[in-house]
């Protein structure tokens, strides 16, 4: 049974937010054995996902179809949340990641039970798929902390390619590190609210 936990951190923007609290509240999904075989998440965190410009990411998901909206939310509408599962990555990213002892921090993102965001590198798209553990590499994203309490999500399977916003949809965007590292369309905010 799922409980709505009240977390001490309002933004998952830095490692301190994740590790600082002594009482790291494990999401019960992990307790129920939904963690990757042989790899346990460091922690799991429920957060709403919004863009740098404060548009909300919402999910309309059926058994056979889905839509991912990037939109200004109506005042009376609760924000959707994603379950972020944090893992220590063994694979170096194309830039120095945010981790401990040289290890990257990777995340998976789930909007509801048994479904995860996945990178489709051929189509440059972000998709939702029903998966069983262990999750495919396409479901893992290296987490990068940016300025202004923002994060970005880099594809594990395609370094240099990030989840971003294009034409009011989520898409995969290749980033030129020398020019567009702070590009707003790959910046996201994570919030408990």
């Amino acid at each position: 049974m799922h409980h709505h936990h009240h977390h001490h951190h309002h933004h998952a923007a830095g490692l301190n937010d994740i590790f600082e609290a002594q009482k790291i509240e494990w999401h019960e999904a992990a307790i129920e054995g939904r963690s990757i075989t042989g790899i346990s998440p460091i922690t799991e965190y429920l957060a709403s996902l919004s863009t740098y410009n404060d548009q909300s990411i919402t999910f309309a998901l059926e058994d056979e179809s889905y839509e991912i909206y990037v939109e200004d939310l109506k005042k009376d509408k609760k924000k959707d949340k994603v379950l972020l599962s944090y893992y220590e990555s063994q694979h170096p990213s194309s830039e120095s990641g945010d981790g401990v002892d040289g290890k990257m921090l990777m995340v998976t993102l789930s909007p509801t039970k048994d479904f995860w965001l996945q990178a489709n590198n051929k189509e440059h798209s972000v998709e939702l798929h029903k998966c069983e553990k262990p999750l495919p590499d396409q479901a893992f994203f290296v987490l990068h902390n940016r300025s202004f309490n923002c994060v970005s999500f880099e594809c594990k399977t395609d370094p240099g390619v990030f989840i971003g916003v294009k034409d009011n949809h989520l898409a995969l965007i290749k980033v030129d590190y020398s020019e567009n590292l702070g590009s707003e369309n790959i910046l996201f905010k994570l919030s408990e609210i």
Epitope: H2, D63, K74, D76, T112
Partner: antibody
Framework: EVQLLESGGGLVQPGGSLRLSCAAS????????MSWVRQAPGKGLEWVSG????????YYADSVKGRFTISRDNSKNTLYLQMNSLRAEDTAVYYC???????????????????WGQGTMVTVSS | SYVLTQPPSVSVSPGQTASITCSGE??????AAWYQQKPGQSPVLVIY???KRPSGIPERFSGSNSGNTATLTISGTQAMDEADYYC?????????FGGGTKVTVL
């Protein structure tokens, strides 16, 4: 194909009880919030009760609170409505309805009713 | 409790446009859905999220929502569109329906 099949309706005396069932098929039942909506003869639609998929939280209209109990058995793909202390004004066709989309981790009743059963008639009369 | 108000009836000639209103306090802050119900049948969702049509619903059905009023518009109304129409919103984890509008195609 999504199918919702209600059963359990019938004639009952005021103060009596009935248990409605809704057998679901064609979708992942455990992932969707479900509701009961009723319609008195010649009247409009009235939402009665709903139940979350994520944590099985329950919600009720004021008119039935304390008398009706909604529940679900995900292993049987079945939604229930236990109706006690029935009154004449509870006479209606009772529809089982599925949310259009799977429930997000936020939980609660948030989405429109995408699919409806054919309804089962409940008559409360002496 | 939250109240949604619809006109009891709307009459329209075949091929003309029928507009059904649904009024509620700060309606535009909520997402409106519309259901069609023909006699002896279960309701069918025809509009959700104010403006979106489920698959299988004809393009002549459209919706809008702003201020205190949501509107369902049926363009080029056909005889088969004669039915009762209900608006609905979610308010504090409860469903709230309007009283319904009977659309008669003359």
């Amino acid at each position: 194909e999504v199918q919702l099949l209600e059963s359990g309706g019938g004639l009952v005396q005021p103060g009596g009880s009935l248990r409605l069932s809704c057998a679901a098929s064609g979708f992942t039942f455990s992932s969707y919030a479900m509701s009961w909506v009723r319609q008195a003869p010649g009247k409009g639609l009235e939402w009665v009760s709903g139940i979350s998929a994520i944590d099985q939280s329950t919600y009720y209209a004021d008119s039935v609170k304390g008398r009706f109990t909604i529940s679900r058995d995900n292993s049987k793909n079945t939604l229930y409505l236990q109706m006690n202390s029935l009154r004449a004004e509870d006479t209606a066709v009772y529809y089982c309805a599925r949310d259009l989309w799977m429930e997000n981790w936020v939980g609660g009743l948030r989405y429109p009713f995408g699919y409806w059963g054919q309804g089962t008639m409940v008559t409360v009369s002496s | 409790s939250y109240v949604l108000t619809q006109p009891p009836s709307v009459s329209v000639s075949p091929g003309q446009t029928a507009s059904i209103t649904c009024s509620g306090e700060r309606m535009g802050d909520k997402y409106a859905a519309w259901y069609q119900q023909k006699p002896g049948q279960s309701p069918v969702l025809v509009i959700y999220r104010d403006t979106k049509r489920p698959s299988g619903i004809p393009e002549r059905f459209s919706g809008s929502n702003s201020g205190n009023t949501a509107t369902l518009t049926i363009s080029g109304t056909q005889a088969m569109d004669e039915a009762d129409y209900y608006c609905e919103v979610k308010k504090s984890d409860t469903g709230v329906f309007g009283g319904g509008t009977k659309v008669t195609v003359l």
